[in-house]
């Protein structure tokens, strides 16, 4: 196994549709053609798998049908998009890139991307 | 909250081996950097082995070098210590010590670590 960079913002800001969206990018060390792609989140002292997606090249990542995230592929770029945040799910959330195939397999894990959400305020009574 | 329980322990005659568990009750240990210490009586408590959270690394003091293997078994949620070739001077009470580092040092193993299970007793005599 060997190690391989991954690059992620710092900090995102979760719409006020609890949508969260941010780019997980890896330094690609040869010409994969399998990559599985994990979304972990840490929080109190716990790391806990968010979602994962395995993709070939130039295709789609393809997610579990109930899952919270959707995403694409360009390059060696992931955009990853996470729908239906609320503020209990503020949490550093970390892009985890495995290159499966063809050997070696590489290993690279992204420093984090803190997501912060924001449950929105309900509104006040209309008189209307 | 987490709380880590070792097993395994025991008395085994020199040349023998064990097989020490570190197991996480009330969470996981995923990701986590594990690391084995020992105590003898009247000795300074000393670091045997770690693991990294990836699994990726290992360190191992000199003493127990080509002795002692450590593994993660992620699917059991344990940190396993396998010592082989065991001499007297290994009889010690074994601790397992676990810390979530942040993801940029998950390839690495902790300097300290916040957490100690309660020990576990290994005798090696004859």
């Known amino acids: 196994c060997k190690a391989m960079h991954v690059a992620q913002p710092a900090v995102v800001l979760a719409s006020s549709r609890g949508i969260a969206s941010f780019v997980c990018e890896y330094a690609s060390p040869g010409k994969a053609t399998e990559v599985r792609v994990t979304v972990l989140r840490q929080a109190d002292s716990q790391v806990t798998e968010v979602c994962a997606a395995t993709y070939m090249m130039g295709n789609e990542l393809t997610f579990l049908d109930d899952s919270i995230c959707t995403g694409t592929s360009s390059g060696n770029q992931v955009n990853l998009t996470i729908q239906g945040l609320r503020a209990m799910d503020t949490g550093l959330y970390i892009c985890k890139v495995e290159l499966m195939y063809p050997p070696p397999y590489y290993l690279g894990i992204g420093n984090g991307t803190q997501i912060y959400v924001i449950d929105p305020e309900p509104c006040p009574d209309s008189d209307f | 909250e987490v709380q880590l329980v070792e097993s395994g322990g025991g008395l085994v005659q020199p040349g023998g081996s064990l097989r020490l568990s570190c197991e996480a009750s009330g969470g996981t240990l995923d990701y986590w950097s594990i690391g084995w210490f020992r105590q003898a009586p009247g000795k300074e408590r000393e670091e045997v082995s770690c693991?990294?959270?990836?699994?990726?690394?290992?360190n191992y003091a000199d003493s127990v070098k080509g002795r002692f293997t450590i593994s993660r078994d992620n699917s059991k949620n344990t940190v396993i210590l396998q010592m082989n070739s065991l001499r007297a001077e290994d009889t010690a009470v074994y601790y397992c010590?676990?810390?979530?580092?942040?993801?940029?040092?998950?390839?690495?193993?902790?300097?300290?670590?916040?957490?100690w299970g309660q020990g576990t007793q290994v005798t090696v005599s004859s």
């Open positions: 693991i990294s959270g990836t699994g990726l690394r290992t």
């Open positions: 010590t676990g810390k979530l580092l942040h993801p940029s040092l998950w390839s690495a193993c902790a300097n300290e670590y916040d957490l």
